[in-house]
Amino acid sequence: QGGTRSPRCDCAGDFHKKIGLFCCRGCPAGHYLKAPCTEPCGNSTCLVCPQDTFLAWENHHNSECARCQACDEQASQVALENCSAVADTRCGCKPGWFVECQVSQCVSSSPFYCQPCLDCGALHRHTRLLCSRRDTDCGTCLPGFYEHGDGCVSCPTSTLGSCPERCAAVCGWRQMF
């Protein structure tokens, strides 16, 4: 269309970058560069990332998409969010399991494995903090149980058993001699 004045672009901003001969507009997230633009400040030829690949950001030079990660079944990982053209698979642990980092300085990209959460109920204890990012935090013994060593012991149901100091305090009675 004769006479229309083209917008100025100088390759310096985020909008256009020099690709090949010209400053070109980049490809949107989820697309890769098939061919650079064929005129100044033109649109590059961009194609959607194929299945099982992604590109999370607008880009100017990526001529292929990144392969989606597979969650590590050996480490009991599951996919919390499936891979899309714009985002990688988000791996995590299924309900009742928690993330145990394999490195000391743990960040979101660190390798990890999934551990089953402690079942406080099975240990006859109160659940103080539910298991998600770390293991369950169990509290005191449930009613009808008292602390004995590392565990919770059921209150005696008859007078035949002995009931030490802690038992008596929790279970509410002392064996008569």
Epitope: D10, L21, F22, E39, H61
Partner: antibody, heavy 123, light 111 residues
Framework: EVQLVESGGGLVQPGGSLRLSCAAS????????MSWVRQAPGKGLEWVST????????YFPDSVKDRFTISRDNSKNTLYLQMNSLRAEDTAVYYC????????????????WGQGTLVTVSS | DIVMTQSPDSLAVSLGERATINCRAS??????????MQWYQQKPGQPPKLLIY???NVESGVPDRFSGSGSGTDFTLTISSLQAEDVAVYYC?????????FGQGTKLEIK
């Protein structure tokens, strides 16, 4: 003094292949985009291919796309044109040209040309 | 593709006279206020030579009798006073967008 010297032309049968070379001297080869332009006997000029400086992206018209490839070896100051699946209509003198960029407008003009090399496609 | 059409196809001009060659693009070759087109001269048996770039800028070493004008879609190459060595074919070419395209050429002869 800028010099461009083409070589590799000759007689080839239809369907055959040929690789043209262009030896450059007298300028910083790696800093320039480079082109091939052809001229059929008694006819006008036709752009065949361009390769960018730096990232070496290549460009072709539809008439040669998927048959020709352009490449460069900056360490040897040499431009190449690989021509496959040649046809009778590819018969022409092939010129190598330097593309000079003017100003900040991403505007190119071919400011130096070689003498050309003749490619004849015939059975 | 942008089609470049030159007129006339051939031209005969007397020595010392003005020669004018026209070139029309099928769409505008303007970008950011610059006309992305150039003129080449090709003498018999020689490669083309750049004469004019950006429609009106004379390449260094080219005699000042050569000039270019025009914008948008219509362009003119003018030789103010024809010399014997100006006998050649003249081509316009656009660099606005790929594929780069040339005019069909204008053959300039001496009358």
């Amino acid at each position: 003094e800028v010099q461009l010297v083409e070589s590799g032309g000759g007689l080839v049968q239809p369907g055959g292949s040929l690789r043209l070379s262009c030896a450059a001297s007298g300028f910083t080869f790696s800093s320039y985009a480079m082109s091939w332009v052809r001229q059929a006997p008694g006819k006008g000029l036709e752009w065949v291919s361009t390769i960018s400086d730096g990232d070496s992206y290549s460009y072709f018209p539809d008439s040669v796309k998927d048959r020709f490839t352009i490449s460069r070896d900056n360490s040897k100051n040499t431009l190449y044109l690989q021509m496959n699946s040649l046809r009778a209509e590819d018969t022409a003198v092939y010129y190598c040209a330097r593309d000079r960029i003017y100003g900040s407008v991403q505007y190119y003009a071919m400011d130096y040309w070689g003498q050309g090399t003749l490619v004849t496609v015939s059975s | 593709d942008i089609v470049m059409t030159q007129s006339p196809d051939s031209l005969a001009v007397s020595l010392g006279e003005r020669a004018t060659i026209n070139c029309r693009a099928s769409e505008s070759v303007e970008f950011s206020g610059t006309s992305l087109m150039q003129w080449y001269q090709q003498k018999p048996g020689q490669p083309p030579k750049l004469l004019i770039y950006a429609a009106s800028n004379v390449e260094s070493g080219v005699p000042d009798r050569f000039s270019g004008s025009g914008s948008g879609t219509d362009f003119t190459l003018t030789i103010s006073s024809l010399q014997a060595e100006d006998v050649a074919v003249y081509y316009c070419q656009q660099s606005r967008k790929l594929p780069y395209t040339f005019g069909q050429g204008t053959k300039l002869e001496i009358k």
